[in-house]
């Protein structure tokens, strides 16, 4: 009987010899549950598992807790991989998180965190980040220490308001904080002075809604 080869992340896919960008099926160890993820096999040495992408506003990111838990969208386009998968993956070994950003003027920037993991669902998928470098700001636009994840039906933020309803999208809101990469997608020339756009404050400042974002992870020892 032929043994089924499975990969937990895109780094394993890359090391197995598949070095082409594209959608691959991933499976966690000791699990039968599969997820489809986009693998970036070119950027910075390859092996990156894309956990979020915004590029054209084609997918609605104002989703429920369950949808953010299991993932939604199209891995070839705009999507969210899923908090549960990312939580389990990042608690099995050490991962880095790279956030790549594009503005409407043709500029690109990134933030790289040398250690990233999400807590379990019981702890509201709280984000943990350490060691920021990159060109998208010297201060982390994801509030530190990390916050719990909030969605339109799960208010875990530190605001008297409900950040996910006010800003739209699920995110690790503070009150509400300097970022929200899952906010409303605004087209060019309609992307400034926005209270609920795709925000990364320490790169583009207040009210600027970005053209594109990609969140990707890779084992630290890759």
């Amino acid at each position: 009987k032929e043994e089924q080869i499975s990969f937990r992340d895109c780094a394993e896919v890359f090391k197995s010899g598949h070095t082409t960008n594209g959608v691959y099926t991933l499976t966690l160890p000791n699990s039968t549950e599969e997820v489809k993820a986009y693998c970036d096999m070119e950027a910075g040495g390859g092996g990156w598992t894309i956990i979020q992408r915004r590029e054209d506003g084609s997918v609605d990111f104002q989703r429920t807790w369950k949808e953010y838990k299991v993932g939604f969208g199209n891995p070839s386009g705009e999507y969210w991989l899923g908090n549960e998968f990312v939580s389990q993956l990042t608690n099995q070994q050490r991962y880095v998180l790279k956030i790549h950003l594009k503005d409407w003027e043709g500029n690109e920037a990134y933030s790289l965190y040398e250690h990233f993991y999400l807590s379990s669902e019981e702890l509201n998928y709280r984000i943990h980040l350490k060691g920021l470098t990159g060109t998208a700001g010297k201060i982390s636009s994801i509030s530190q220490p990390g916050n719990d994840f909030s969605t339109k039906d799960a208010d875990n933020d530190k605001c008297i308001c409900k950040c996910s309803q006010m800003l739209t999208g699920g995110w690790w809101f503070d009150a509400c904080g300097p970022s929200n990469l899952n906010g409303m997608y605004y087209p060019q020339r309609q992307n400034t002075n926005k209270f609920n756009g795709i925000k990364w404050y320490y790169w583009k400042g207040s009210g600027y809604s970005l053209k594109g974002t990609t969140m990707m992870i890779r084992p630290a020892d890759f």
């Epitope: 006010m166 009150a175 002075n193 926005k194 756009g197 207040s206």
Partner: nanobody
Framework: EVQLVESGGGLVQAGGSLRLSCAAS????????IGWFRQAPGKEREGVSA????????YYADSVKGRFTISSDNDKNTVYLQMNSLKPEDTAVYYC??????????????????????WGQGTLVTVSS
């Protein structure tokens, strides 16, 4: 479309007065807080004063307390900053900005700079000695 337009800046002698206006459109002052900020050449943008119509709260930086007064006119959807006893160190570009009033951290009264998502273009205030 949210828009903020400042006016009223100019050149004034030390000890003089100016009144800045911030005309808001695309939203009503009832639901938002409006802040005045300033930025001098080579310096960080700093908060000067703010007003929240929903509960009547006002805020002043220590450096302007007793000299500046913030007020609003809901009918005109405009916020004013009356600046008296001006000093050369008040020289800066003055901006007004808006934040949804409810975007407050538990236990806090005011908002960090990054919560103000709508900004005007600014008006220059020059105080000569």
């Amino acid at each position: 479309e949210v828009q903020l337009v400042e006016s009223g800046g100019g050149l004034v002698q030390a000890g003089g007065s100016l009144r800045l206006s911030c005309a808001a459109s695309g939203f009503t002052l009832d639901d938002y807080a409006i802040g005045w900020f300033r930025q001098a050449p080579g310096k960080e943008r700093e908060g000067v004063s703010a007003i929240r119509d929903s509960d009547g709260s006002t805020y002043y930086a220590d450096s302007v307390k007793g000299r500046f007064t913030i007020s609003s006119d809901n009918d005109k959807n405009t916020v004013y900053l009356q600046m008296n006893s001006l000093k050369p160190e008040d020289t800066a570009v003055y901006y007004c900005a808006a934040v949804p009033a409810g975007r407050l951290r538990f236990g806090e009264q005011w908002y960090p700079l990054y919560e103000y998502d709508a900004w005007g273009q600014g008006t220059l205030v020059t105080v000569s000695s």
